[in-house]
């Protein structure tokens, strides 16, 4: 079986401030099991965003059913866009381990671009 | 939701000292973390930030160059390194949890009283 | 950078009556405003979010309204309890994160 890819298939993405942003993310594989996790920036500055397994994110919605065993869809919605939200977005799997998961790979990004709100 | 902040006193101007602050009743390593200071009789002051993984800080200009902050993970604590201290770093400092990564303060520790004074 | 600017600086109302805070920010900050509550000798605590949405716990007599650069607080009826300095904090443009220099309401 070929080794898990994960998509990002837009390179950017641009949205009005207070708008909605959806960044779109599928793998290929379901092995190895474990759990997605959304960053913002790379390297050891970045912003988590989204993590599947923990955590509580209000401004996050994932657009399909992550309990779902087959799901490889791991798009999410980000609510209430502000200009701090600007970045680059990386979609990252993780391999299932003891006693911490393990970043197995990631995503190419999408770059969310924040338009200010017309006055 | 709790926080407890620990590690404050009385220091000369130019020593150091390092406030810690103990997390608990949430994902600590989901959040990103700030400590924020009052001076007697006067209002809040945005000093630090750190992100969930630890590796990205911000300061306000007031200390930078002066104060580190670092978050232990593992152990579910966040920690304000002061050096070379000046009277008018004076204050309670409180340490704050973040709602998400860009968002407000939705919980406040009860704070640690820094005293500089020669 | 963002400044927030509160009035008045200290509100004297009597128990039962309405008091209404204002914070205006020197730019647009969408509705990315927070209001915190802090009463003498305690930690701040935080009432309203996103400019009108009440934090866990939060009595229904606090209400947020506003958006842009004009908000206000409103405490519908006053009681003896709600004896503190309020802060208004942006969260659109960061850092650094700023605070509003606070309202102290009083008991008449």
């Known amino acids: 079986e070929e080794e898990l890819q994960v998509i990002q298939p837009d390179k950017s993405v641009l949205v009005a401030a207070g708008e909605t942003a959806t960044l779109r993310c599928t793998a290929t594989s379901l092995i190895p099991v474990g759990p997605i996790q959304w960053f913002r920036g790379a390297g050891p500055g970045r912003e988590l965003i989204y993590n599947q397994k923990e955590g509580h994110f209000p401004r996050v919605t994932t657009v399909s059913d992550l309990t779902k065993r087959n799901n490889m869809d791991f798009s999410i919605r980000i609510g209430n866009i502000t200009p701090a939200d600007a970045g680059t977005y990386y979609c990252v799997k993780f391999r299932k381990g003891s006693p911490d998961d393990v970043e197995f790979k990631s995503g190419a990004g999408t770059e969310l671009s924040v338009r200010a709100k017309p006055s | 939701v709790q926080l407890v902040e620990s590690g404050g006193g009385v220091v000369r101007p130019g020593e150091s000292l390092r406030l810690s602050c103990a997390a608990s009743g949430f994902s600590f390593s989901s959040y990103a973390m700030n400590w924020v200071r009052q001076a007697p009789g006067e209002g809040l002051e945005w000093v630090s930030r750190?992100?969930?993984?630890?590796?990205?800080?911000d300061y306000a200009e007031s200390v930078k160059g002066r104060f580190t902050i670092s978050r232990d993970n593992s152990e579910n604590t966040l920690y304000l390194q002061m050096n070379s201290l000046r009277a008018e770093d004076t204050a309670v400092y409180y340490c704050a949890k973040q709602y998400d990564w860009n968002g407000f303060f939705d919980y406040w520790g009860l704070g640690a009283l820094v005293t500089v004074s020669s | 950078e963002t400044v927030l600017t509160q009035s008045p600086a200290t509100l004297s109302v009597s128990p039962g009556e309405r008091a209404t805070l204002s914070c205006r920010a020197s730019?647009?900050?969408?509705?990315?405003l927070a209001w915190h509550q802090q009463k003498p000798g305690q930690a701040p605590r935080l009432l309203i979010y996103?400019?009108?949405r009440r934090a866990t716990g939060i009595p229904d007599r606090f209400s947020g309204s506003g958006s842009g650069t004009d908000f206000t607080l409103t405490i519908s009826s006053l009681q003896t309890e709600d004896s503190a300095v309020y802060y208004c904090?942006?969260?659109?443009?960061?850092?650094?994160?700023?605070f509003g220099g606070g309202t102290k309401v009083e008991i008449k």
């Open positions: 904090q942006q969260y659109y443009y960061w850092p650094p994160y700023r």
């Open positions: 996103d400019a009108s």
């Open positions: 730019q647009t900050v969408g509705s990315k």
């Open positions: 750190i992100n969930s993984g630890g590796g990205g800080t």
